[in-house]
């Protein structure tokens, strides 16, 4: 999916008002220095591509984050503010949710959510030069 035509300001507003808090809640009890940020993004569409991938694609050690509150809100934001997103992506993420068995917060998932926090912060500062 091409995130170029999304309403970035509305997505940013949703992140600031609620998604960011859910990410913090998920990470509670974890030191902010515990994980190094290894995933980066260069502009807003690229950031959303990476956010979509890390949030909804299963990875080794972290089967799925799709049922977490921050993920449900991310999906809602992309569905309403990215034209055509629902038709191409929602069924795929729904299928992943169905395959998932039980909710386990592994260290790998915490690391993944830490990466997500970094991507979202970068999404909110699109004019900053890449480090």
């Amino acid at each position: 999916y091409d995130f170029t035509n999304c309403d970035f300001e509305k997505i940013k507003a949703a992140y600031l008002s609620t998604i960011s808090k859910d990410l913090i809640t998920y990470m509670s009890g974890t030191k902010s220095t515990e994980f190094n940020n290894t995933v980066s993004c260069s502009n807003r569409p690229h950031c959303l591509t990476e956010i979509q991938s890390l949030t909804f694609n299963p990875t080794a050690g972290c089967a799925s984050l799709a049922k977490e509150m921050f993920a449900m809100k991310t999906k809602a934001a992309l569905a309403i503010w990215c034209p055509g997103y629902s038709e191409t992506q929602i069924n795929a993420t729904q299928a992943m949710k169905k395959r998932r068995k039980r909710k386990v917060t592994t260290n790998k998932c915490l690391e993944q959510v830490s990466q997500l926090q970094g991507l979202w912060r970068r999404f909110n500062r699109p004019l900053l030069k890449q480090q």
């Epitope: 509305k10 609620t18 809100k73 809602a76 309403i80 990215c82 034209p83 038709e87 929602i90």
Partner: antibody
Framework: QVQLVQSGAEVKKPGSSVKVSCKAS????????ISWVRQAPGQGLEWLGV????????NYAEKFQGRVTITADTSTSTAYMELSSLRSEDTAVYYC?????????????WGQGTLVTVSS | QSALTQPPSASGSPGQSVTISCTGS?????????VSWYQQHPGKAPKLMIY???KRPSGVPDRFSGSKSGNTASLTVSGLQAEDEADYYC???????????FGGGTKLTVL
């Protein structure tokens, strides 16, 4: 059962505001879109705006920007639409409508409608 | 002035078919497969009849069908019945700003 129940009819003076409520039951309120649509007497349907309660960030039709405020309270599964600076042409039946989950632009459930009359 | 254009009226005899058109632009109907149709009886709330151009919600008879060509969407009611007499509104997604547009409505009369 699955339904949207709206508040009762209102009569308002020009220049004042009206706030209409829409209580949802029988479904998970948060992840659906709640849109507000109005219909003036003998006229067609007109979309005012939408909110996804889970996110709390509304989208408004350009025509009503600055005059309409849509909010949602997930604790009571209730959405609200407030329209300010009322004029006679705002006299209409106001409907809340549920936008399907993640497909917010088609409305599969409607409230019964609230008649708002603006008259001096 | 509605952004989507529908004929104000349409009619047909019981058992016949009738098609209602809805014309928009590249920014709405032509740009997305997000057209829906609503039926409204006098004094009642609208009811979803067709969504995503041609899908029917459960409970809607298969006499109702939808299609799209370019910037124009169509609703066809075949085997007309007396209870089909109502107003019909088309609707289309129109991007993240405008979001939803409605047509002006078509009054369907069963003769």
């Amino acid at each position: 059962q699955v339904q949207l129940v709206q508040s009762g009819a209102e009569v308002k003076k020009p220049g004042s505001s009206v706030k209409v409520s829409c209580k949802a039951s029988g479904f998970t309120f948060g992840s659906y879109g709640i849109s507000w649509v109005r219909q003036a007497p003998g006229q067609g349907l007109e979309w005012l705006g939408v909110i996804i309660p889970l996110l709390g960030v509304p989208n408004y039709a350009e025509k009503f920007q600055g005059r309409v405020t849509i909010t949602a309270d997930t604790s009571t599964s209730t959405a609200y639409m407030e329209l300010s600076s009322l004029r006679s042409e705002d006299t209409a039946v106001y409907y809340c409508a549920r936008g399907a989950e993640y497909f917010y632009w088609y409305f599969d459930l409607w409230g019964q409608g609230t008649l708002v009359t603006v008259s001096s | 002035q509605s952004a989507l254009t529908q004929p104000p009226s349409a009619s047909g005899s019981p058992g016949q078919s009738v098609t209602i058109s809805c014309t928009g632009s590249n920014s709405d109907i032509g740009g997305y497969n997000r057209v829906s149709w609503y039926q409204q009886h006098p004094g009642k709330a609208p009811k979803l009849m067709i969504y995503e151009i041609s899908k029917r919600p459960s409970g809607v008879p298969d006499r109702f069908s939808g299609s799209k060509s370019g910037n124009t969407a169509s609703l066809t009611v075949s085997g007309l019945q007396a209870e089909d007499e109502a107003d019909y509104y088309c609707s289309s997604y129109a991007g993240t700003d405008t979001f939803v547009l409605f047509g002006g409505g078509t009054k369907l009369t069963v003769l």
